[in-house]
Structures are given as structure tokens and as C-alpha cells.
């Protein structure tokens, strides 16, 4: 599905007319508040379906979600759906109207809910208050959805200021019907540590006041108990945390760490586990293969990427022909190393608008105090071929010669072809290939030179034609992996007084 304008959020002018288009490989339809507004559908000759939604004389009440979906998703691989959110800032509309059921929010467990007070202007500052209080509550606000958080059984209102006028929303009533399941989360400061370093894990429970923590861990099985510490996160009500801290880890501390939490009132329980690896020493390991010969095309940009795992975080250096590389101020080279997960890294060398001089031997070295790894490759700069010269001569020997000279990298192949019927060539008649050993009428001599400084090959080929009895179109074509180039010359018999 393709939506234009793409969004995902648009701010439109009140009273304006706006056009939204959605297209796809099957019939598509716009939806607004679970209904299909009037729209115009079409099918293009290329089989593309489209639907055009015209929003006329926009008001603040047009603020909201718009979806484009396939009209009949049964025959499609995915239930693809594109969402667009439109704001129409309108000073005459305060808070968007809610259905009655949206004003009453019932909870069966402690969970995050949203108080759906929305405004038409994403620039407005909106605050949340208890119905009988002036103090703004510290709850995050999303202009597309409302205030999201964990709320107590109270009544709430939203406030905003439009111009110089303060506007209040309807009241929202939150009712918690019962305290239900426990939700446990476990995380570690690091899931990979070296022996002698510390292991620290945290198990957090939200929304319960009295809970019991029980940890299982590799040391426990060998009878070496560790006393966890439990605390209350004061800035977050009903967040209880248990910390398991193992100083000076040993290799045997590798394994699964499980936090089991129970509460006795409703006899609910939950548990989460995490794996910890203790390594003898740090490591750096390459992931995936990088070929020893890499290619880049002249004047194009090229990114060379190396993926590796390491702990602890390594230093990464790049070298070219044993000289250290750094980000160039001219923007010709960019180096970056990203940490994509706790122990996984991606290092990239980007050559911008590659030059011939950037060919050479490249090495990436990643190291820390325990280990190092390096990866090397040769970078070859590919240069599209070009024919530099195509000339014809007829020495005294009576034969006629055509000389073709060109350059490129990698080494160009040369193809000679000729056409005898100038009027019909090359459209109607295919040209004849020349220079085959069986062909007595022509002889071919080709020399190849490698120019070290320019790092490219030069090909010089001479075609000797024995008998030219009528004008002949001779074509020299040079080809290599990144392109081809052709030139053509007309060869006329000796007897004719002119040459075309």
C-alpha cells in the first residue's frame, strides 16, 4: 500500500480542501472511525488500484486516524493497513468529543491505560488533573491518543489553553475492578561478564504491595547462597525490586537466572529468566565472511561493512596500506562503529565518490586488552571502459588496418565487427564478428598493458583487412564488468578516391 502524502502525521488548515490517495495491487479503501467515507476508486491500466479521499472544508472534527486497507484482504498475504493521523487546528473546537463509553475506564488488572482526551492542534499544551485538584499530574501525553499511564481509581480531567481561554475536557472515571496478575521483568546490567567481574540482576514487579521473591541461579545448586536485596522504588508507586548481586563471578556462574514472584492474596505468581555468560577472558569474533577482494566503481560511493562480536567493548581502527584512517574533513571517508546489541558491533568504512587512489589494501582491527581480530581485503576500483581512439590506415603492403585503443578496469574485452551493406546496417543486418582464426580476410593483433599509476588496463588492438572491395563499416566494442563503449569507422577500398 502506498499513501500520499505519506504522513504518518499531517497538520492541515481549517476550511481547506485536502486530497489523500492510497494505491495498491488489489482494491483499496479509506476508513475513518470504522466506516468508509465517500471516496473515488479507480483501476489503472497497469493493474494498480487507487482510492482518492477528498476532505473538503476541513474543521477540527476531522482530526483523527485515517486508515487505508485492502478492500478484500482474504486473498492477500498480509492484512496490510496504513495509518495516517490528521490534525486540523481549530480554535472553535476544544477537546474532541468522546463516546460515552470512553469516559468510563474499567480495569481488571494493573495495566497501563489511556485517558483519551485529544485536541485538534499538536502544538497545544495539555495537562491532566484529578477532577478536584489543580496540580498537573506527571503523565506522558500523546496528542494522537491522550494520557497513558497507570491510574488509580479516581476521576480525571484534561485542561488546555486555546488563545486566552482555558478549556476543560469531560471527566473520565477510572474503576479498578480487581487486582490481578503479577507482571515480572528481569534485566541484567550485563549478560556477558569476564571472570572476576560482578553479576548484577534486577527483578521488578509493578502494581503489588506485598510480594515474595525467589531466585534460582547456578551457585544456589552448589549450596552457595547469595542474599538478594529488596527495595521499593519510591518515585514509582508499587514498583518493588529485588537485586541479586554476585561479586567476582566465576565460570561456574554461567547459566540461567530465574526470578519467581508470588503474592498470597490471590495466589498469583509469575517468573522470568535470563541467561548470563561468564567468560574466561574478553573476546573479539568476526561474524560472517568478507571476501578478500572487494570492488568499488569509480566516482560512486561504497560502504564496506564488518560485523563482529566483542566483550568488553573494543577499540576499532581502519588502515589503508598500513596507514591509519580517520574521518576526512573533506567528507571523502566516513568511519563508524555501532553497537547493535550488547556484544555485537557493526563497523563501516564509507568511501564517498571513490577515486582511483583509494584502491589498495584495507584492514579493520578490533581489539581490547584481552583479544584482537583483524580483517583485510584488497579494494579494486572498477573503471568503465572507454574507446580512446579508432583510426584507419592503409600502408603500402596493400592491406588496410584499423587500430582501436581503449582503457578500463577490470581488463576490457575487445570485439570487432563489420557490416558491408551500409544502408541496411546495423538495423536490418546484424554485423559480422571479425578476427576469428578461421577468417582469412582479417587478422587481429591485440596488446594489453596495465598502467600502475592509473590502476587500469589499456588495450590496443589492430585489425588487418586483406581485401576491401567496397565500403565497410568497422566497429570496435570494448566491454568490461562495469560498462561498454563502441566506436565505428568506415573503411573504403584503395581504388575509391575518397573516404567517408
Amino acid at each position: 500500500l502506498v499513501v500520499t502524502p505519506p504522513g504518518p502525521e499531517l497538520v492541515l488548515n481549517v476550511s481547506s480542501t485536502f486530497v489523500l490517495t492510497c494505491s495498491g495491487s488489489a482494491p483499496v479503501v479509506w476508513e475513518r472511525m470504522s466506516q468508509e467515507p465517500p471516496q473515488e476508486m479507480a483501476k489503472a491500466q497497469d493493474g494498480t488500484f487507487s482510492s482518492v479521499l477528498t476532505l473538503t472544508n476541513l474543521t477540527g472534527l476531522d482530526t483523527g486516524e485515517y486508515f487505508c486497507t485492502h478492500n478484500d484482504s482474504r486473498g492477500l498475504e498480509t492484512d496490510e493497513r496504513k495509518r495516517l493521523y490528521i490534525f486540523v487546528p481549530d480554535p472553535t473546537v476544544g477537546f474532541l468529543p468522546n463516546d460515552a463509553e470512553e469516559l468510563f475506564i474499567f480495569l481488571t488488572e494493573i495495566t497501563e491505560i489511556t485517558i483519551p482526551c485529544r485536541v485538534t492542534d499538536p502544538q497545544l499544551v495539555v495537562t491532566l488533573h484529578e477532577k478536584k485538584g489543580d496540580v498537573a499530574l506527571p503523565v506522558p501525553y500523546d496528542h494522537q491518543r491522550g494520557f497513558s499511564g497507570i491510574f488509580e481509581d479516581r476521576s480525571y480531567i484534561c485542561k488546555t489553553t486555546i488563545g486566552d481561554r482555558e478549556v476543560d475536557s469531560d471527566a473520565y472515571y477510572v474503576y479498578r475492578l480487581q487486582v490481578s496478575s503479577i507482571n515480572v521483568s528481569v534485566n541484567a546490567v550485563q549478560t556477558v561478564v569476564r571472570q572476576g567481574e560482578n553479576i548484577t540482576l534486577m527483578c521488578i514487579v509493578i502494581g503489588n504491595e506485598v510480594v515474595n521473591f525467589e531466585w534460582t541461579y547456578p551457585r544456589k545448586e552448589s549450596g552457595r547462597l547469595v542474599e538478594p536485596v529488596t527495595d521499593f522504588l519510591l518515585d514509582m508507586p508499587y514498583h518493588i525490586r529485588s537485586i541479586l548481586h554476585i561479586p567476582s563471578a566465576e565460570l561456574e556462574d554461567s547459566g540461567t537466572y530465574t526470578c519467581n514472584v508470588t503474592e498470597s492474596v490471590n495466589d498469583h505468581q509469575d517468573e522470568k529468566a535470563i541467561n548470563i555468560t561468564v567468560v574466561e577472558s574478553g573476546y573479539v569474533r568476526l561474524l560472517g565472511e568478507v571476501g578478500t577482494l572487494q570492488f568499488a566503481e569509480l566516482h560512486r560511493s561504497r560502504t564496506l561493512q564488518v560485523v563482529f562480536e566483542a566483550y568488553p567493548p573494543p577499540t576499532v581502527l581502519w588502515f589503508k596500506d598500513n596507514r591509519t584512517l580517520g574521518d576526512s574533513s573533506a567528507g571523502e571517508i566516513a568511519l563508524s562503529t555501532r553497537n547493535v546489541s550488547e556484544t555485537r558491533y557493526v563497523s563501516e568504512l564509507t568511501l564517498v565518490r571513490v577515486k582511483v587512489a583509494e584502491a589498495g589494501h584495507y584492514t579493520m582491527r578490533a581489539f581490547h586488552e584481552d583479544a584482537e581480530v583483524q580483517l583485510s581485503f584488497q579494494l579494486q576500483i572498477n573503471v568503465p571502459v572507454r574507446v580512446l581512439e579508432l583510426s584507419e590506415s592503409h600502408p603500402d603492403s596493400g592491406e588496410q588496418t584499423v587500430r582501436c585503443r581503449g582503457r578500463g578496469m577490470p581488463q576490457p574485452n575487445i570485439i570487432w565487427s563489420a557490416c558491408r551493406d551500409l544502408k541496411r546496417c546495423p538495423r536490418e543486418l546484424p554485423p559480422t564478428l571479425l578476427g576469428n582464426s578461421s577468417e582469412e580476410e582479417s587478422q587481429l593483433e591485440t596488446n594489453v598493458t596495465y598502467w600502475e599509476e592509473e590502476q587500469e588496463f589499456e588495450v590496443v588492438s589492430t585489425l588487418r583487412l586483406q581485401h576491401v572491395d567496397r565500403p565497410l563499416s568497422v566497429r570496435c566494442t570494448l566491454r568490461n564488468a562495469v560498462g561498454q563503449d563502441t566506436q565505428e569507422v568506415i573503411v573504403v577500398p584503395h581504388s575509391l578516391p575518397f573516404k567517408v
Epitope: T17, F18, V19, T21, A42, V52
Partner: nanobody, 123 residues
Framework: EVQLVESGGGLVQAGGSLRLSCAAS????????MAWFRQTPGKGREFVAA????????FYQDSVKGRFTISRDNTKNTAYLQMNSLKPEDTAVYYC????????????????WGQGTQVTVSS
């Protein structure tokens, strides 16, 4: 890609009429919005009129309301602008535009444009 070719421009006396045509090729015509814009020397293009894919909606610049009529024939892949009661201030190059996504009256909302046809209204 959509190609747009305008025709029908010319010289006409004040009070006269002209009918501009915009022929589209290169893709099915049923889908896109079509519009006419005009430009006088030294000024930017200004919106004249627009029509939705199935002719459900038409929009006009205030100064041409009641005098100009936009229409389309999707079977012929063509949009038209019938201009009556022409005034000297209607003199301009008239451009056809197609495939709107955005505010109907903004030129930046349109993806494809014709080369334009000159309309001159003499007093």
C-alpha cells in the same frame, strides 16, 4: 509516468470564450485529480480550477467562479476548461496538472504537469 498535453489556447476578444483541453497519456486516467493553473510573466502559478477523479468535486478560484467550468472525460483521458466571459486579466499561460496529494489549491500538491498553452484576451 503521465504525460499531459494542453491545447485550445489562442487570442480572443474580451467577453469571448475558449475551451482548453488537456490530454493525458501513459497511464489510466480514472485515478488522478486534474487541475488548471495559470501564470503571468513575473508571477508564480496560480490555481484556477480542479476536478476529482469521478467528477464528484470541483473547485474554483473565486475570480473565475461562474465564468469557467472544469470537466473531464475519463473515456478519452481528457480534462477540459470552458472559459466564458473572458477578461484581459485572464491573459496567461494555462497549465494542466495531474495527480494531487495534498491541498487541492497548491501547485506543490501535483505530481505531473503539461507544457502550458497561451491564452491572450485583448480588450
Amino acid at each position: 509516468e503521465v504525460q499531459l498535453v494542453e491545447s485550445g489556447g489562442g487570442l480572443v476578444q474580451a467577453g469571448g470564450s475558449l475551451r482548453l483541453s488537456c490530454a493525458a497519456s501513459g497511464r489510466a486516467f480514472g485515478g488522478p485529480y486534474m487541475a488548471w493553473f495559470r501564470q503571468t510573466p513575473g508571477k508564480g502559478r496560480e490555481f484556477v480550477a480542479a476536478i476529482s477523479p469521478s467528477s464528484v468535486y470541483t473547485f474554483y478560484q473565486d475570480s473565475v467562479k461562474g465564468r469557467f467550468t472544469i470537466s473531464r472525460d475519463n473515456t478519452k483521458n481528457t480534462a477540459y476548461l470552458q472559459m466564458n466571459s473572458l477578461k484581459p486579466e485572464d491573459t496567461a499561460v494555462y497549465y494542466c496538472a495531474a495527480e494531487a496529494a495534498g491541498e487541492v489549491r497548491l501547485e506543490t500538491s501535483y505530481k505531473y504537469w503539461g507544457q502550458g498553452t497561451q491564452v491572450t484576451v485583448s480588450s
